[in-house]
């Protein structure tokens, strides 16, 4: 008998190594597991990162290493440890032949072990003429605060820390790990080796053309004069950064990884630890005109990935390649033809291109506004980027079309006050990783440790989904998105907001089997319906129009299909409000929309009814999406028939806590 | 080629275990949702378990918080483990691929599973 | 959980007749019903998915209807190789996936 699916076994492993960049992995934590680069080309076999369980001390890290130095010796082996971690992850660095793997793997608290790579800047061409320094009349670019309090760690090319704009604002450190330039007639340039980093620091806090002209700034040198660097040497300057912040505390610090390489679990891991310890890491989405999630840092969900849009609003293009986009994309900034310092001299400027160049508009923002609100966690300063970000002004049709509805449509913009914002209810749309094709195949959406899950959607482009809920998982509420069989798999929506002292629940209602529908609601006192979810085990609903969608008198209730169990997301926080707003069409349509007024945060956004030739439901910005299979392809105009249902929220206490502020 | 091998059967005492494994070859088990199916000599065909493609676990009501399922994407294999067996337990299990747009496309031969004392 | 029940549980036929094999589902199933042939000591073959494809390498003769709750297998033209038992299955409201009793083709 043939394979009959012998394709769709290419497409997953192909998938799967580019996504999780994983060789052969045991799955129950019995068994360490080895890791590398998707990428060939920048592979860097016979250097390892042999990471270990996340509660070994250093002592043991050192005992493992020289455990294996002395296991492989006995085979006959050489091995050098290059480093030992500690401060950020324990494990160590070591320059071994590969052969060695199986033993390095077997020893005790190895977590995983990953093969050394390649990471590279993102900023395309290095030098194009010089121009000279744009002057600034009073009235133009003068921001309230320059983020003078804020300390903005550069980890990039050496730098000019000479030149006119940057003088006395960038501190250069001693930190360096970087390696040999690539071919033998290289000659090292200092001109060219502190392009990339020069023209960065400029950018952020500039004196002439910098965002937050008040930031200072650490630069540690992690790529060499051709812009190139590896995993290992950028973690190295992650355990580097976290060292001095342990033993000098200071006011927030930004970390600018303006470098991007394949998918990297540990580099990953790495960022997500420094994120945890409170510091705010912004990253280049990579210029690789590919999906985002296949590069790191720029997959890591802790790090805030900037993408490149021109003065147009377009995405950026980089000769044949360009900006990257998709899901692992926070938002976009300015990336093309970006006017910063020169390393050619200590007045010249040059114009840049890149989503390094976008991320650095984006570390400087961040650093104004934790200059005017030290106390903001990393949570609170992503949804505040993202509110204040332009909104639907990039066009799309320059992206992928399987990546359009995951790609965040903002351009990052400075807050028109950098106070006065905390009245506002913050919320953010999170997508899973597609969960593939297999009956049983789920995705999950998980929102930051700071963000209350308010609800949960899903979507398919194929229309074949058993719905959506949220679960508990470790303590957490996850979004959780069930394929159905024969479809091409889903995606679980999450919708991730900031609603201090709240305590939200999850009541479930089983399928009602009657031909009213099931209906759940908030019972508990105080608490408000924020978002509403359904999920069915049959592989194909029925069509089912509910009689009545919403009796009156009733908001904090969810309704859908009979077959289905139907969650409902309920909340308590103080001052908290909520109102259902639905939008429905009696013709089949491929898209209705429903959006939350001014003053109103859309926190759910559901689709009525449940059948299957609706695609799903999606909260973009604060408008609620729900999609349904092409028009001509749908039946009946009844079974065409859809409403949007949003559930949009808002803060009295926020508010009042803000005025008092005021 | 795509084989399912079993193994792991035998005889065994009503209250014991055994863990039966299933051995993919031709693909890559872990990519596809697996399943263990069996039949009590001259009976039907019953479902047991199965595992996700997503690491998701499923079981029929009379084998559930005994049987666990589980796999090992390094040896491509999955596995059933058996505790606190019944004489009703007694069949042939057969281990089963779903495929993406077939169910079950690929078969164990099937290992048989004795519980008496 | 759905109940499948198929009817006869044993069908004699002559070669080269045509046989006709009933499954029923307590509740609607959509056409989400396999057919699956299992001689004595082997492993169960699919036959028919969807309740009316043809898996890959079945022959011609082999054909599946219906939707809803009423479903047939019918083979053509019976040949030796054919004497079996036959399952159907419904896979559209899980866990668990059930199993029709089968039905029994054998030599008049």
């Known amino acids: 008998q043939e394979d009959e699916d012998g394709d769709y076994e290419e497409l997953v492993l192909a998938l799967r190594s580019e996504e999780d960049g994983l060789a052969e992995a045991p799955e129950h934590g019995t068994t360490a597991t080895f890791h590398r680069c998707a990428k060939d080309p920048w592979r860097l076999p016979g250097t390892y990162v042999v990471v270990l369980k996340e509660e070994t001390h250093l002592s043991q890290s050192e005992r493992t290493a020289r455990r294996l130095q002395a296991q492989a010796a006995r085979r006959g082996y050489l091995t050098k440890i290059l480093h030992v971690f500690h401060g950020l992850l324990p494990g160590f660095l070591v320059k071994m032949s590969g052969d060695l793997l199986e033993l390095a793997l077997k020893l005790p608290h190895v977590d995983y072990i990953e093969e050394d790579s390649s990471v590279f800047a993102q900023s395309i061409p290095w030098n194009l003429e010089r121009i000279t320094p744009p002057r600034y009349r009073a009235d133009e670019y003068q921001p309230p605060d320059g983020g003078s309090l804020v300390e903005v760690y550069l980890l990039d090319t050496s730098i000019q820390s000479d030149h006119r704009e940057i003088e006395g604002r960038v501190m250069v450190t001693d930190f360096e790990n970087v390696p040999e330039e690539d071919g033998t007639r290289f000659h090292r340039q200092a001109s060219k080796c502190d392009s990339h980093g020069t023209h960065l620091a400029g950018v952020v806090s500039g004196r002439d053309a910098g965002v937050a002209k008040g930031a200072s700034m650490r630069s540690l040198r992690v790529l060499n004069c051709q812009g190139k660097g590896t995993v290992s040497g950028t973690l190295i300057g992650l355990e580097f950064i976290r060292k001095s912040q342990l033993v000098q505390p200071v006011g927030p610090l930004v970390v600018l990884l303006p470098l991007a390489g394949g998918y990297s679990r540990v580099l990953n891991a790495a960022c997500q630890r420094l994120a945890r310890a409170g510091v705010v890491l912004v990253t280049a989405a990579g210029n690789f005109r590919d999906d985002a999630c296949l590069y790191s840092p720029a997959s890591a969900p802790e790090v805030i990935t900037v993408g490149a849009t021109n003065a147009q609003d377009q995405p950026v293009t980089l000769g044949t390649l360009g900006t990257n986009f998709g899901r692992c994309v926070d938002l976009f900034a300015p990336g093309e033809d970006i006017i910063g310092a020169s390393s050619d001299c200590s007045t010249c400027f040059v114009s840049q291109s890149g989503t390094s160049q976008a991320a650095a508009h984006v570390a400087g923002i961040a650093a104004m506004m934790l200059s005017a609100e030290p106390e903001l966690t990393l949570a609170e300063l992503r949804q505040r980027l993202i509110h204040f970000s332009a909104k639907d002004v990039i066009n799309e049709a320059w992206f992928p079309e399987d990546q359009r509805v995951l790609t965040p449509n903002l351009v990052a913009a400075l807050p028109p006050s950098t106070h006065g914002a905390g009245w506002q209810l913050f919320c953010r749309t999170v997508w899973s990783a597609h969960s593939g094709p297999t009956r049983m195949a789920t995705a999950v959406a998980r929102c930051a440790p700071d963000e209350e899950l308010l609800s949960c959607s899903s979507f398919s482009r194929s229309g074949k989904r058993r719905g959506e809920r949220m679960e508990a998982q470790g303590g957490k509420l996850v979004c959780r998105a069930h394929n159905a069989f024969g479809g091409e798999g889903v995606y679980a929506i999450a919708r991730c907001c900031l609603l201090p002292q709240a305590n939200c629940s999850v009541h479930t209602a089983p399928p009602a089997e009657a031909s009213m529908g099931t209906r759940v609601h908030c019972h508990q006192q105080g608490h408000v319906l924020t978002g509403c979810s359904s999920h069915w085990e049959v592989e194909d609903l029925g069509t089912h129009k509910p009689p009545v969608l919403r009796p009156r008198g009733q908001p904090n209730q969810c309704v859908g299909h009979r077959e289905a169990s139907i969650h409902a997301s309920c909340c308590h926080a103080p001052g908290l409000e909520c109102k259902v707003k639905e939008h429905g069409i009696p013709a089949p349509q491929e898209q209705v929309t429903v959006a939350c007024e001014e003053g109103w945060t859309l926190t759910g956004c559901s689709a009525l009814p449940g059948t299957s030739h609706v695609l799903g439901a999606y909260a973009v910005d604060n408008t609620c999406v729900v999609r349904s299979r092409d028009v001509s392809t749908t039946g009946s105009t009844s079974e065409g028939a859809v409403t949007a249902v949003a559930i949009c929220c808002r803060s009295r206490h926020l508010a009042q806590a803000s005025q008092e502020l005021q | 080629e795509v084989q399912l091998v079993e193994s792991g059967g035998g005889l065994v005492q009503p209250g014991g275990s055994l863990r039966l494994s299933c051995a993919a070859s031709?693909?890559?088990?872990?990519?596809?949702?697996m399943h263990w199916v069996r039949q009590a000599t001259g009976k039907g065909l019953e479902w047991v378990s199965a595992?996700?493609?997503?690491?998701?676990?499923y079981y029929t009501g009379s084998v559930m918080g005994r049987f666990t399922i589980s796999r090992d994407a390094a040896k491509n294999s999955f596995y059933l483990e058996m505790n606190s067996l019944r004489v009703g337990d007694t069949a042939v299990y057969y281990c089963?691929?779903?495929?993406?747009?077939?169910?079950?496309?690929?078969w164990g031969q099937g290992t048989l599973v004795t519980v008496s004392s | 959980e759905i109940v499948m029940t198929q009817s006869p549980a044993t069908l004699s036929v002559s070669p080269g007749e045509r046989a006709t094999l009933s499954c029923r589902a307590s509740?609607?199933?959509?056409?989400?019903v396999a057919w699956y042939q299992q001689k004595p000591g082997q492993a169960p073959r699919l036959l028919i998915y969807?309740?009316?494809t043809r898996a890959t390498g079945i022959p011609a003769r082999f054909s599946g209807s219906g939707s809803g709750t009423e479903f047939t297998l019918t083979i053509s033209s019976l040949q030796s190789e054919d004497f079996a038992v036959y399952y159907c299955?419904?896979?559209?409201?899980?866990?668990?996936?059930?199993f029709g009793p089968g039905t029994k083709v054998d030599i008049k």
């Open positions: 299955q419904q896979y559209n409201n899980w866990p668990p996936f059930t």
């Open positions: 595992i996700g493609s997503t690491g998701d676990t």
């Open positions: 509740q609607s199933v959509s056409s989400n």
């Open positions: 969807g309740a009316s």
């Open positions: 031709g693909f890559t088990l872990s990519s596809y949702d």
């Open positions: 089963a691929r779903e495929g993406i747009r077939t169910p079950y496309d690929y």
